[in-house]
Interface confidence: low
Amino acid sequence: QPPPPPDATCHQVRSFFQRLQPGLKWVPETPVPGSDLQVCLPKGPTCCSRKMEEKYQLTARLNMEQLLQSASMELKFLIIQNAAVFQEAFEIVVRHAKNYTNAMFKNNYPSLTPQAFEFVGEFFTDVSLYILGSDINVDDMVNELFDSLFPVIYTQMMNPGLPESVLDINECLRGARRDLKVFGSFPKLIMTQVSKSLQVTRIFLQALNLGIEVINTTDHLKFSKDCGRMLTRMWYCSYCQGLMMVKPCGGYCNVVMQGCMAGVVEIDKYWREYILSLEELVNGMYRIYDMENVLLGLFSTIHDSIQYVQKNGGKLTTTIGKLCAHSQQRQYR
Amino acid sequence: SAYYPEDLFIDKKILKVAHVEHEETLSSRRRELIQKLKSFINFYSALPGYICSHSPVAENDTLCWNGQELVERYSQKAARNGMKNQFNLHELKMKGPEPVVSQIIDKLKHINQLLRTMSVPKGKVLDKSLDEEGLESGDCGDDEDECIGSSGDGMVKVKNQLRFLAELAYDLDVDDAPGNKQHGNQKDNEITTSHS
């Protein structure tokens, strides 16, 4: 394509440039040598100035950012929406699990309420916090639940004659609970189930949130000056020759994009691995690795553990009577 | 929440769990998400091609711009000349990713490691320790309804886990969402730069 003749005007370039930037003073009236141009290197007179070139570079980089954002829009929507859905759904599961457990106490062990409600509430609050990333130890949570429940079970059901809320004996009972394994292997069972299912749930949510962070990072990438120059040559340098209608060659576009996206494309390997690893995790999220299954069945396991205590009640009362005698004597004096 | 009716599924007098007809379990929602995510598995490698197909590129035109001049669309010059005597594309690639990209790659590596560590090995759903301690009370067979509790008095069965009810807060069928899925090989009606 021959360059415009020296007597030609830059009218069309002016009207096109006006769309990008108010300030026609930047556009030459007639083609100029353009010796100061750094990107749209002219083969003859040109309708572009250095200022126009800078504006084109800025626009090209902005265009690129917008194209990138529109490319990731659906993916971003998918992950953000699902992260929100799962977070709320998990909270709902926890709420229902708490309500099931409270209902079980109310219907089967009314004498243990309202203290049991308090301990159950604390336990499930910790469960929620753990899922959201709090630095809480699951074994400690389960131990705390049974440590708190046992003194109430002992003083309300097994030995109702004792004065209520005896701090000394409560401390002794909490210790005895672990030493004597008063709930059998149920606390250990609950620990294993709860910790496995909650760990998986927590990492699942963390992974979704990281997915959002990955998209956000690439969405807001600032492209390099070199990339801006390449994009300008591809999208806008034709304007300097008055070629408003021509479009970049397909192969040329691919070469430029690969250059601009070289850094971003490096994410690809890890992104693929991320999706496949997440799939593997999800495939394993059932039975004891599914918090929905575990937490909603928890009230049943707690019920079984209390029945276990009741079954061994006589033997336990005698042993604890001896073990915590010192505390009781002090209390009666 | 709009997910579930606020009233509990429990009739407190007899501790009966209402059987909500099957809508959608959390696990099916998870699997659905993974399927949709897998359609984006090539997202990053396909980006350059996707962006070219969604920006003005000569498709049906005889002539196209190669960065320096108008050339025949299928000529050797179509991809080559535009890059000559300008800045080295190889150099641009050699610079390596931006610090933010390197950071996000590190985070991805970390989460991938965690995900692999947490993934349940195939065929080993229950730990040996649990088998030994006996899981009978809470673990019902796959084919039957999932049990909550043993058959003791006052215990109940909840049919096939907690349900997603119809009142889901968001319609997550993303098929109608903006954008297109398989970014790698989609060609949009290209935007012909004109003069409107």
Epitope: Q1, P2, P4, P5, A8, T9, C10, H11, Q12, S15, Q18, R19, L20, Q21, P22, P31, T59, L62, N63, Q66, L67, S70, Q241, G242, L243, M245 | H54, D188, N189, I191, T192, T193, S194, H195, S196
Partner: antibody, heavy 107, light 108 residues
Framework: QVQLVQSGAEVKKPGASVKVSCKAS????????ISWVRQAPGQRLEWMGW????????KYSQKFQGRVTITRDTSASTAYMELSSLRSEDTAVYYC?????WGQGTL | EIVLTQSPLSLPVTPGEPASISCRSS???????????LDWYLQKPGQSPQILIY???HRASGVPDRFSGSASGTDFTLKISRVEAEDVGVYYC?????????FGGGTK
């Protein structure tokens, strides 16, 4: 798929104003200008004006200067054309056009 | 402003036959870059105009190759090598050299 979707038909009394919207999708809205063209029954197409979707700059046809206002909302990828002091001869189908794509028209 | 005069006003054609529409400009539409800033549009019944040819002779994406445009000074011609039933409508020429953009009167 590039699409320009315009608002529905309007009936106005002489002297009133009308505002027509044009929602763009399928391309980067701020990258191109949007023209407004009208077509009165049995008349040729008539260019009214243009807006730079990127910076909001406008250019109007002398014929409509003072009566037409073209605006845009980048967050909604939408351009608007408001025509005031309506007369009976303003009865027409109004089109928005960007690049080589046209809206479906608003009567 | 630039005035565009189209002829004929109406053009009955049998499918399979060629057709030719003329558009004369009141002044040159030749830009210094060598392109003629004239476009051809087709408006099918009940539809919006759609681009056929831009810059005098460049066929737009997706336009069948039976459509072609040519220029000779201020005279522009749109040719259809073999008319098909779906080509029914009003054909307009439009100049994009300067504002206001102007259109021809149309050929049915």
């Amino acid at each position: 798929q590039v699409q320009l979707v315009q608002s529905g038909a309007e009936v106005k009394k002489p002297g009133a104003s009308v505002k027509v919207s044009c929602k763009a999708s399928g391309y980067t809205f701020t990258s191109y200008g949007i023209s407004w063209v009208r077509q009165a029954p049995g008349q040729r197409l008539e260019w009214m004006g243009w807006i730079n979707a990127g910076n909001g700059n406008t250019k109007y046809s002398q014929k409509f200067q003072g009566r037409v206002t073209i605006t845009r909302d980048t967050s909604a990828s939408t351009a608007y054309m408001e025509l005031s002091s309506l007369r009976s001869e303003d009865t027409a189908v109004y089109y928005c056009a960007t690049v080589v794509y046209w809206g479906q028209g608003t009567l | 402003e630039i005035v565009l005069t189209q002829s004929p006003l109406s053009l009955p054609v049998t499918p399979g036959e060629p057709a030719s529409i003329s558009c004369r400009s009141s002044q040159s539409l030749l830009h210094s870059n060598g392109y003629n800033y004239l476009d051809w549009y087709l408006q099918k019944p009940g539809q919006s105009p759609q681009i056929l040819i831009y810059l005098g002779s460049h066929r737009a994406s997706g336009v069948p190759d039976r459509f072609s445009g040519s220029a000779s000074g201020t005279d522009f011609t749109l040719k259809i090598s073999r008319v098909e039933a779906e080509d029914v409508g009003v054909y307009y020429c439009m100049q994009a050299l300067q504002t206001p953009l102007t259109f021809g009167g149309g050929t049915k």
